[in-house]
Interface confidence: low
Amino acid sequence: RTVPPMVNVTRSEASEGNITVTCRASGFYPWNITLSWRQDGVSLSHDTQQWGDVLPDGNGTYQTWVATRICQGEEQRFTCYMEHSGNHSTHPVPSGKVLVLQSHW
């Protein structure tokens, strides 16, 4: 069986002039997935990204995330790219007020 992920991109304040953007994938099966941040369509270096473990979410499916820190005001240049079981999609950073959330960093 294959269950596609739901992908959600959020933003949080990291430090002055910077924000952390987090791309979360959840509810997918099997566990094999690729999440990666891109800037202007080019994959970011892996050492500028932080990945969460792929974990079971209790429903027989899995969840994971990838985060990176970017300059506030450049959000439109960044997208989260997802590949799962032969399907792929691209997800932009939402515009609007920066939410003050705990950073992964």
Epitope: W31, N32, I33, T34, G41, H46, D47, W51, Y81, E83
Partner: antibody
Framework: QVQLQESGPGLVKPSETLSLTCTVS????????VHWIRQPPGKGLEWIGM???????DYNAAFISRVTISVDTSKNQFSLKLSSVTAADTAVYYC?????????????WGQGTLVTVSS | EIVLTQSPGTLSLSPGERATLSCTAS???????LHWYQQKPGQAPRLLIY???NLASGIPDRFSGSGSGTDFTLTISRLEPEDFAVYYC?????????FGQGTKLEIK
């Protein structure tokens, strides 16, 4: 079954462009990405670059000024072009499929094609 | 760039013995992005282990991988004649994505 087959001229003159194709079967070009890797005779492996399922490319910075990787879904082919070649580009060139969820690992490889750069 | 140093360069063992191959990175590598390949003479490499410790499809369980940070290990618990080959570690953590120089496993 999954197969990848590299093809192209075995001999290229210095300063010319090396052009190779990777013809695939057993999987869809729209659902798998492909890497290009090379191996000089008697030496180790060197990653050249890759193309994602949506056509986006990532290149090794050592080649970025002279490499192009592309896809032609109608022909079931990926291509590699490397310009301004020198004798140092003599190598066996491989294409390899990027496995799903394998964190960019290469799960199937072509048999490789030897390209010699010489006048 | 991250340099991967494999040791030993050549390992001479007999069938039935245990083989331990080392891969040391010049800086830390995420375990998700450290892979091992096997290459026999005249053949293309094949994926052996991905993400440090996961066996690729069709690979027998006498192969195992471990490690984290800068130190990674490939172990073959009981060597079979078909295991004698060159083994490469490969990191996809930081560009340029690099391979080790290889360890040649030869019959003693």
């Amino acid at each position: 079954q999954v197969q990848l087959q590299e093809s192209g001229p075995g001999l290229v003159k210095p300063s010319e462009t090396l052009s190779l194709t990777c013809t695939v079967s057993g999987f869809s070009l729209t659902t798998y990405g492909v890497h290009w890797i090379r191996q000089p005779p008697g030496k180790g492996l060197e990653w050249i670059g890759m193309i994602w399922t949506d056509g986006t490319t990532d290149y090794n910075a050592a080649f970025i000024s002279r490499v192009t990787i592309s896809v032609d879904t109608s022909k079931n082919q990926f291509s590699l072009k490397l310009s301004s070649v020198t004798a140092a580009d003599t190598a066996v060139y491989y294409c390899a499929r990027k496995g799903h969820g394998y964190y960019y690992a290469m799960d199937y490889w072509g048999q490789g094609t030897l390209v010699t750069v010489s006048s | 760039e991250i340099v991967l140093t494999q040791s030993p360069g050549t390992l001479s063992l007999s069938p039935g013995e245990r083989a331990t191959l080392s891969c040391t990175a010049s800086s830390s590598v995420s375990s998700s992005y450290l892979h091992w390949y096997q290459q026999k003479p005249g053949q293309a490499p094949r994926l052996l282990i991905y993400s440090t410790s996961n066996l690729a499809s069709g690979i027998p369980d006498r192969f195992s991988g471990s490690g984290s940070g800068t130190d990674f290990t490939l172990t073959i618990s009981r060597l079979e004649p078909e295991d004698f080959a060159v083994y490469y570690c490969h990191q996809y953590h930081r560009s340029p994505f690099t391979f080790g120089q290889g360890t040649k496993l030869e019959i003693k």
